[in-house]
Interface confidence: low
């Protein structure tokens, strides 16, 4: 046996050379460079100005790269989607050298991380998608995508996060790998949109007059911009936009003795308008005098008999339906009749007398304006 000394030169973290001398008692059996660097990994760095890649060889030693130039274990000026062959050697290993095929990825600017969230769902969902914005010749089968959002990891080109909290910030990191080598990455912080406001709390909702009603409420908890108050009577619907500071609204010009259904919701104008749940209430306005009967006719059926008819009022304004007829001669009330319909047969009147016929509608609470006609009986023909 004889002594053999070998020297290894490595770079320290400061960049200065460190020479270590190892004395071995036997003839060393160095590995082949092909074996030593069998599992070498590579990172690709992209230069946006030159649009060329640099391949960074993940080795500890300063290796030699055969016919290619290596600087600090980096191979420069590699064209996207083109293969380059690098012959790696080092004095710590023997021939044959490691032949490394650099499969250069596509240019970084050919990919764009795009927010694909639908505006309608932007309050509770996030969608992120890598888009190919230019063509390239690399095999797309060799491209893989990875996303990490919080503790969730996805191996997809597009991700959709659902059931998120409105108005919250979420961070997602993503990277693209080509033949399992990362060549670009991006991070996005996305704030979910304003959510739908909550439901306002109606405190009271009532009518204390024939033409008016009032509604008061507490605002919802979540952010909102304004209120919409709708009131529906039968099939008619009217809606109003109300300022966010309001907590009370007086409804005017309502129809008497009518049921109104009210709905109140808050809304927010975010990426789209989002309406909160509507709070509902209803009231019936008080009665009021009915309008006048119309198309009243008085016709003679015989010498001393009259037939009085009229059409119902346009607005009844109350719960009941009753027609009244008052017949006066001079200032004396001679008849006072009440029917379900406006159809009166007045008999046994004095002949050759002037009569005043007053017909009006009564709704159970109020009488209406009378419709007045004058008519005379004739001189008896018998």
């Amino acid at each position: 046996a004889y002594l053999n000394a070998s020297e290894t030169t490595t770079l320290s973290p400061s960049g200065s050379a460190v020479i270590s001398t190892t004395t071995i008692a036997t003839t060393p059996s160095k590995p082949t460079c092909d074996e030593k660097y069998a599992n070498i990994t590579v990172d690709y760095l992209y230069n946006k100005e030159t649009k060329l890649f640099t391949a960074k060889l993940n080795v500890n030693e300063n290796v030699e790269c055969g016919n290619n130039t290596c600087t600090n274990n980096e191979v420069h000026n590699l064209t996207e989607c083109k293969n380059a062959s690098v012959s790696i050697s080092h004095n710590s290993c023997t021939a044959p050298d490691k032949t490394l095929i650099l499969d250069v990825p596509p240019g970084v600017e050919k990919f764009q991380l795009h927010d694909c969230t639908q505006v309608e769902k932007a309050d509770t969902t996030i969608c992120l998608k890598w888009k190919n914005i230019e063509t390239f010749t690399c095999d797309t089968q060799n491209i893989t995508y990875r996303f990490q959002c919080g503790n969730m990891i996805f191996d997809n080109k597009e991700i959709k996060l659902e059931n998120l909290e409105p108005e919250h910030e979420y961070k997602c990191d993503s990277e693209i790998l080509y033949n399992n080598h990362k060549f670009t990455n991006a991070s996005k912080i996305i704030k979910t949109d304003f959510g739908s406001p909550g439901e306002p709390q109606i405190i009271f909702c009532r009518s204390e007059a024939a033409h008016q009603g009032v509604i008061t409420w507490n605002p919802p908890q979540r952010s909102f911009h304004n209120f919409t108050l709708c009131y529906i009577k039968e099939t008619e619907k009217d809606c109003l936009n109300l300022d966010k500071n309001l907590i009370k609204y007086d409804l005017q010009n309502l129809k008497p003795y009518t049921k109104y259904v009210l709905s109140l919701h808050a809304y927010i104008i975010a990426k789209v308008q989002r309406n909160g749940s509507a709070a509902m209430c209803h009231f019936t306005t008080k009665s009021a005098p009915p309008s006048q009967v119309w198309n009243m006719t008085v016709s003679m059926t015989s010498d001393n008999s009259m037939h009085v008819k009229c059409r119902p009022p346009r607005d009844r304004n109350g719960p009941h339906e009753r027609y009244h007829l008052e017949v006066e001669a001079g200032n004396t009330l001679v008849r006072n009749e009440s029917h379900k319909n406006c159809d009166f047969r007045v008999k046994d009147l004095q002949y050759s007398t002037d009569y005043t016929f007053k017909a009006y509608f009564h709704n159970g609470d109020y009488p209406g304006e009378p419709f007045i006609l004058h008519h005379s009986t004739s001189y008896n023909s018998k």
Epitope: Q221, S223, N245, L246
Partner: antibody, heavy 119, light 106 residues
Framework: EVQLVESGGDLVQPGRSLKLSCVAS????????MTWIRQVPGKGLEWVAS????????YYPDSVKDRFTISRDNAKNTLFLQMNSLRSEDTATYYC????????????WGQGTSVTVSS | DIQMTQSPSFLSASVGDRVTIICKAS??????LDWYQQKLGEAPKLLIY???NLHTGIPSRFSGSGSGTDYTLTISSLQPEDVATYFC????????FGGGTKLELK
């Protein structure tokens, strides 16, 4: 640029009246609630009156209720404050402000007009 | 009426200090609280609306927080130009200002 310019401040005797004006420019006046706020020199701020965009809703604190009247002329982009039965405690700088759409506070203020009530 | 109690009424701090101003409401105001800055001889300026939303153009060293009856304005690193009086305003029911905090440099 949003601008609010107040005018009408003066020295008046107690019991007299004064009308303040505030001309708005640089924004759609009839879309915003407006408000008057006053400040006694070296003291805090006190809300005086607020009016909705259409003029349909008006609010006052008890200290000025029945004495002050807020109004607006949307065609002329002008806000008014009619002050009657003035008292010495009404002495202050009066600011008009636009109420911020996303909140109830003023996001744009005028430079103020000075009202002094003294005999 | 809702009362707003602001503290402290006077505050002296050094450049770079973290400064905190507190407003207490006499009842729950549901985050309807704004903060204003008023420099000498100027009109007040909106800093923060609805508790924690920074108004356009306001530096990010200003922040707001709170809920219920207790609200806070924080200046993370005091700058010379922050010397001013600060007011809070509740607007859930009518409008009430706090008494103000005069902030000076040590």
């Amino acid at each position: 640029e949003v601008q609010l310019v107040e005018s009408g401040g003066d020295l008046v005797q107690p019991g007299r009246s004064l009308k303040l004006s505030c001309v708005a420019s640089g924004f759609t006046f009839n879309n915003y609630w407006m408000t008057w706020i006053r400040q006694v020199p070296g003291k805090g701020l006190e809300w005086v009156a607020s009016i909705s965009s259409s003029g349909g809703s008006i609010y006052y604190p008890d200290s000025v209720k029945d004495r002050f009247t807020i109004s607006r002329d949307n065609a002329k982009n002008t806000l008014f404050l009619q002050m009657n039965s003035l008292r010495s405690e009404d002495t202050a700088t009066y600011y008009c402000a636009r109420l911020y759409y996303y909140s109830g506070g003023g996001d744009a203020w005028g430079q103020g007009t000075s009202v002094t009530v003294s005999s | 009426d809702i009362q707003m109690t602001q503290s402290p009424s006077f505050l002296s701090a050094s450049v770079g200090d973290r400064v905190t101003i507190i407003c207490k409401a006499s009842q729950d105001i549901n985050k309807y609280l704004d903060w204003y800055q008023q420099k000498l001889g100027e009109a007040p300026k909106l800093l923060i609306y609805n508790t924690n939303n920074l108004h356009t153009g306001i530096p990010s060293r200003f922040s707001g927080s709170g809920s219920g009856t207790d609200y806070t304005l924080t200046i993370s690193s005091l700058q010379p130009e922050d010397v001013a009086t600060y007011f809070c305003l509740q607007h859930i029911s009518r409008w009430t200002f706090g008494g103000g905090t005069k902030l000076e440099l040590k």
